[in-house]
Interface confidence: medium
């Protein structure tokens, strides 16, 4: 029958060239020369020449050897003609494959390869994956099939075999126990890929395996134990670094160190942060600590770190003993701020008040006291004592000094300490209103008109304070009741002046007393400016001039 | 490497004291509390107390109060247990060990022992 | 004070044999049990501290475990120098108690 069945032909042939493969026949030569031809890429068209036919025997030629590499199979046609060109058959397939050799070695993809994996982790874990290349053939053949293997392993602790590697995949797995970041922090292993499935030719590559850092250390103290002076009252001051080391990695949330005051703190005086750099623990002051209350604080620090421990790690504890040192307190007036009632006006060297300081500090320490101040000058302070006297006249209507009856003084005490220190306090006299003002009209003059008047309504003001103020009563005196009148309102708080006579255009004096509830009295000259006018008027017309 | 060495046997009398020592080296010594451990003929271990050099503090096992008195110089790198008005009860084999931390004690570096033997 | 109670007071093991003693506190320790070796000569070395953390340069046939009261140190495969006493320890309650004592021998 005109069919070849699919040559074989290995690559890389030696020869001698042309090497026949097959004969094509074809059974119409019975009848009539037949001439063979073929076609098709690697006979007349590229790669030209790789094949060729004897023409009238039929035989199929190889003229140069094969690469699979290059080109795994040909198809190519066979022709069977006549003597005049006609074609007596069909074009028929033939098929070439060309079958491998191991002319290839493996190649890895990358030189040196790098992976990682957390120190500490369970065996069977896979780190990393390596690859390799062979260009011959992995399916009819072992000539392309790599097979991968750990040549070697730096450095060899704890032990030379920590890893392992698929022998298909080239993936890359732990095989022990005891990956330990602080003792080796990388591996490098020689990987090798050698094909016909680890029997045939090897290349090597260069395995890198980062061991990455667990938090599998504990910070701990060193040392242990600190002593620190730390002055009272002292607030955000810095009373201790605290030093922990870490074999974890620098930097890291597995070396950053996280304090806690876990005793001896109870009134909450101490805060604890950690340097940023240094990562020591800064133990500060939070309140000022108080020398006569407590003088020496112990304190029990713990620390952890940022990032939770991997496996139960126990927890390093410091301990501080903190020795307050006494500092020389300013005295402290009881109460900071007094209040003392006093009558206004009493007599000069009258006393006031006694008011004294206590001083924190536990020796007995002398006090002296001095007025720090006095706006009107009106009160003494026996050094010695504390006991205010009055040296001026208190006057709770004094508008300068005195506001809603209080006179506010400051007063110093200053102990004998080394240096000496000073506090101040706030004495509040309210003052005692006494009747030592009379009421006085507003305004005190007026223009009236001398026909039809108005009644001018005058206010009544009194300093003083009730029941020494209103109800108020008015007199006129010195003969001004002959030509004016003057009542007090239903109120009280208001006197009405009358012209009651005619007085011609003038200014006159009415003299008006006025006493208050207390019949403290007090004269006040009105001045009257009188008006030839009718009813209302605020100034005085010009002469009228007839004409 | 971090060493703690003691001084060698003792053999005294009732009633009287004897003053153990015990070297550190290797290790910064003000740091750490030192620990002293009493171990009698064919008994376990007791902890007598601990100091920590850095201080003189010191804390002790309420059962040895009065009976031990423990200190320290730090120039010289070396810890001192005395043990006093002794007694045949107080014959035993007594140990140093620098503690690892000040919670959770563990002791990592131990002293060979100091045997002491009380007989009239 | 707080009681620890070891078991066995004494064994005889083979070379090669799996070896386990076993430590009880009287209450919860936290973890806070160690463990040390007291040759004959009367050395003593830390083995294992805060229940199963190896000291720097114990071998690996060492191991700990236990949580709450209940607390063992395993040899895995004993050698000839493992023989000696060895005593548990409490660090969490002032002050620190050791166990009795086990001591291993070859048969």
């Known amino acids: 029958d005109w069919v070849v069945a699919p040559i074989s032909v290995p690559e890389n042939g030696k020869g001698p060239f042309p090497q026949r493969l097959n004969q094509l026949k074809s059974n119409k030569d019975r009848d009539t020369k037949i001439f063979y031809s073929i076609t098709g890429p690697g006979a007349d068209s590229p790669p030209e020449g790789v094949f060729a036919v004897e023409k009238e025997t039929g035989w199929l030629l190889l003229n140069k050897p094969l690469d699979r590499e290059e080109i795994a199979k040909y198809e190519l046609f066979g022709h069977a003609v006549s003597e005049n060109g006609a074609s007596v058959e069909d074009p028929m397939n033939i098929s070439i494959i060309v079958t491998d050799q191991n002319d290839h070695k493996p190649k890895f993809t990358q030189d040196t390869f790098r992976g990682s994996v957390l120190e500490g982790v369970m065996p069977g874990t896979s780190v990393m994956q390596v690859t390799a290349t062979d260009e011959d053939d992995a399916v009819n053949t072992y000539n392309g099939v790599v097979a991968y293997s750990i040549h070697s392993q730096e450095p060899k602790e704890p032990h030379d075999l920590m890893f392992t590697i698929h022998k298909s995949t080239g993936t890359i797995s732990v095989i022990s126990s005891g990956l330990d970041r602080e003792k080796v922090p990388e591996y490098r292993l020689t990987v090798q890929a050698t094909d016909m499935d680890g029997e045939g030719s090897t290349t090597t590559a260069e395995a890198v395996v980062q061991i990455l850092d667990a938090n599998d250390n504990a910070p701990e103290f060193d040392p242990q134990k600190y002593e620190a002076h730390v002055p009272e009252n002292a607030v955000g001051h810095e009373v201790q670094r605290l030093t922990v080391t870490d074999l974890d990695a620098p930097n890291s949330p597995a070396w950053r160190a996280t304090y806690l005051i876990m005793g001896g703190d109870d009134g909450d005086h101490f805060t604890i942060t950690t340097h940023p750099e240094s990562n020591q623990g800064i133990l500060t002051t939070r309140k000022g600590l108080d020398f006569e209350a407590k003088n020496q604080h112990t304190l029990y620090v713990e620390v952890t770190n940022e990032a939770p421990f991997v496996l139960k790690l126990p927890t390093s504890t410091a301990t501080i003993v903190v020795h307050v040192e006494d500092v020389n307190e300013a005295p402290v007036f009881v109460p900071p701020s007094k209040v003392v009632e006093v009558q206004e006006g009493i007599p000069t060297g009258e006393p006031v008040c006694v008011y004294t300081a206590e001083d924190p500090d536990k020796e007995n320490q002398k006090i002296s006291y001095r007025i720090l101040r006095d706006p009107a000058g009106w009160l003494a302070m026996d050094p010695d004592s504390g006991q205010v006297t009055a040296v001026g006249t208190l006057d709770r209507e004094d508008e300068q000094f005195v506001r809603n009856n209080i006179y506010e003084v400051m007063v110093l005490a200053m102990d004998n300490g080394s240096p000496p220190t000073t506090g101040t306090g706030t004495l509040l006299l309210t003052l005692i209103d006494v009747n030592d003002h009379g009421p006085v009209p507003e305004p005190r003059q007026i223009t009236i008109c001398n026909q039809s008047p108005v009644r001018q309504v005058l206010n009544i003001t009194d300093k003083d304070l009730s029941p020494h103020t209103s109800p108020f009563q008015a007199q006129l005196t010195d003969d001004s009741d002959i030509y004016w009148t003057a009542e007090v309102n239903e109120e009280g708080d208001t006197v009405v002046l009358s012209l009651k006579k005619f007085l011609k255009q003038d200014t006159y004096d009415v003299h008006l007393s006025l006493s208050d509830h207390g019949n403290k009295e007090q004269l006040t000259v009105i001045r009257a400016t009188v008006c030839d006018c009718h009813g209302h008027v605020e100034t005085c017309p010009g002469p009228w001039k007839g004409g | 490497v971090q060493l703690v060495e003691q001084s060698g046997a003792e053999v005294v009398k009732p009633g009287a004291s004897v003053k153990i020592t015990c070297k550190a080296s290797g290790y910064a010594f003000s740091s750490y509390w030192m620990n002293w451990v009493r171990q009698r003929p064919g008994k376990g271990l007791e902890w007598i107390g601990h100091?920590?050099?850095?201080?003189?503090?010191?804390n002790y096992n309420g059962k040895f109060k009065g009976k031990v008195t423990l200190t320290a110089d730090k120039s010289s790198n070396t810890a001192y247990m005395q043990l006093s008005d002794l007694t045949p009860e107080d014959s035993a084999v007594y140990f140093c060990a620098r503690d690892r931390g000040s919670f959770g004690a563990w002791f990592a570096y131990w002293g060979q022992g100091t045997t002491v033997t009380v007989s009239s | 004070e707080l009681v620890m109670t070891q078991t066995p007071s004494s064994l005889s093991a083979s070379l090669g044999d799996r070896v386990t003693i076993s430590c009880r506190a009287s209450?919860?320790?936290?973890?806070?049990l160690n463990w040390y070796q007291q040759k004959p000569d009367g050395t003593v070395k830390l083995l294992i501290y805060y229940t199963s953390r190896l000291h720097s340069g114990v071998p690996s046939r060492f191991s700990g475990s236990g949580s709450g009261t209940d607390y063992s140190l395993t040899i895995s495969n004993l050698e000839q120098e493992d023989i000696a006493t060895y005593f548990c320890q409490q660090g969490n309650r002032n002050p620190p108690t050791f166990g009795g004592g086990t001591k291993l021998e070859i048969k």
């Open positions: 209450q919860d320790i936290s973890n806070y």
């Open positions: 100091i920590y050099p850095g201080d003189g503090d010191t």
